[in-house]
Interface confidence: low
């Protein structure tokens, strides 16, 4: 499969446009917005028919080095009663984002962007039945 | 990827820190290359929370295309169809980092961006403000 | 944090209308969600209407045809014109929303929010 290439033909290169040698990308890491503290509507992964827990990931050699992932906790959805009900389904809702890898090759080191898909929360859908013919 | 000497001498102890600016290969390593949820699943149809989606585009950012959920009611579907008033429904946010082209319009000249996306939505007991 | 403030509430004659109006102000980023619930004399709150940030709309069955909900995004403001009022929709009317909003350099993705209410009295 061809690996997307995040480079754009179609911009025109302003002449203020730093040089970079070919086949690369410079890319600076002081991330835009990274102050913005964010809180969901509180405790909503308790709180939802569909609860989930979450994990963090550490890894020292990927920027962020903090990538926290959700688990759904229930094979199906909790009731109006606290009781789970396995006619409907707990799933995972997932998104892509970004991160750069750091390799070491020898007393050299190269960095990656690779993409990562987050399990960001878990929501309650009604089951696809599979009719046995 | 693009190789960076480090440091002479080559010192054992692992680089705590990323440095501000790197260089990195044009390629992007990746097994997720289906962006559109619309195609990945139908659970924003399927949901007890449904929601629709609604197509973001920037050519100054990659992804270009960022899909973001809207929640289709304040409450959650029942077992009957009907919309239930005594739950609600609630979009669930991420922050997600991507690329903002900077100086704007270079071709390989990228900021890392946090942004904040809806992915979905779920069905939540709504906290109950009493009134005094 | 978030207030909602509604208006136009009053004494009508059965048949008449009225013109509900309800503003969110704050440090709202996004507001998903606008709309209007009642409450009548010795009964629970009910949904009157909602508007989505899509511009889509839900009316309970007892409203449909009569009531008409709208929006106004630049000013953070829904309406709710009332036509065709009768005796039982008399109710104190609660603004609602759910709002994304910045409070203490925090950001509450989504959250409802109430207005204080605004009596509307249908009756001959």
């Known amino acids: 499969r061809k690996i997307p290439k995040v480079g754009h033909t179609f911009f025109q290169k302003p002449e203020s446009c730093p040089p970079v040698p070919g086949g690369s990308m410079k890319l600076d890491i002081g991330i835009i917005n990274e102050n913005q503290r964010v809180s969901m509507s509180r405790n909503i992964e308790s709180r939802s028919t569909s609860p989930w827990n979450y994990t963090v990931t550490w890894d020292p050699n990927r920027y962020p080095s903090e990538v926290v992932q959700a688990q759904c906790r229930n094979l199906g959805c909790i009731n109006a009663q606290g009781k789970e009900d396995i006619s409907m389904n707990s799933v995972p809702i997932q998104q892509e984002t970004l991160v750069v890898r750091r390799k070491h090759q020898g007393c050299s080191v190269s960095f990656q962007l690779e993409k990562v898909l987050v399990t960001v929360g878990c929501t309650c859908v009604t089951p696809v039945i599979h009719h046995v013919q | 990827g693009i190789t960076i000497p480090r440091n002479p001498g080559c010192p054992n102890s692992e680089d705590k820190n990323f440095p501000r600016t790197v260089m990195v290969n044009l390629n992007i390593h990746n097994r997720n290359t289906n962006t559109n949820p619309k195609r990945s699943s139908d659970y924003y149809n399927r949901s007890t929370s449904p929601w629709n989606l609604h197509r973001n585009e920037d050519p100054e950012r990659y992804p270009s295309v960022i899909w973001e959920a809207k929640c289709r009611h304040l409450g959650c579907i029942n077992a009957d169809g009907n919309v239930d008033y005594h739950m609600n429904s609630v979009p669930i946010q991420q922050e997600i980092l991507v690329l903002r082209r900077e100086p704007p319009h270079c071709p390989n000249s990228f900021r890392l961006e946090k942004i904040l996306v809806s992915v979905g939505c779920t069905c939540v007991t709504p906290i109950v403000h009493h009134v005094a | 944090e978030v207030q909602l403030v509604e208006s136009g509430g009053g004494l009508v004659q059965p048949g008449g209308s009225l013109r509900l109006s309800c503003t969110a102000s704050?440090?709202?980023?996004?507001?998903?969600?606008m709309g209007w619930y009642r409450q009548a004399p010795g009964k629970q709150r009910e949904l009157v209407a909602l508007i989505f940030s899509g511009g889509s709309a839900d009316y309970a069955d007892s409203v449909k045809g009569r009531f008409t909900i709208s929006r106004d995004n630049s000013k953070n403001t829904v309406y709710l014109q009332m036509n065709s009022l009768r005796a039982e929709d008399t109710a104190v009317y609660y603004c609602?929303?759910?709002?994304?909003?910045?409070?203490?350099?925090?950001?509450?993705?989504?959250?409802?929010?109430w207005g204080q209410g605004t009596l509307v009295t249908v009756s001959s």
């Open positions: 704050g440090t709202i980023v996004n507001i998903h969600v």
């Open positions: 609602a929303a759910e709002i994304g909003y910045y409070s203490g350099g925090t950001y509450y993705s989504s959250e409802a929010h």
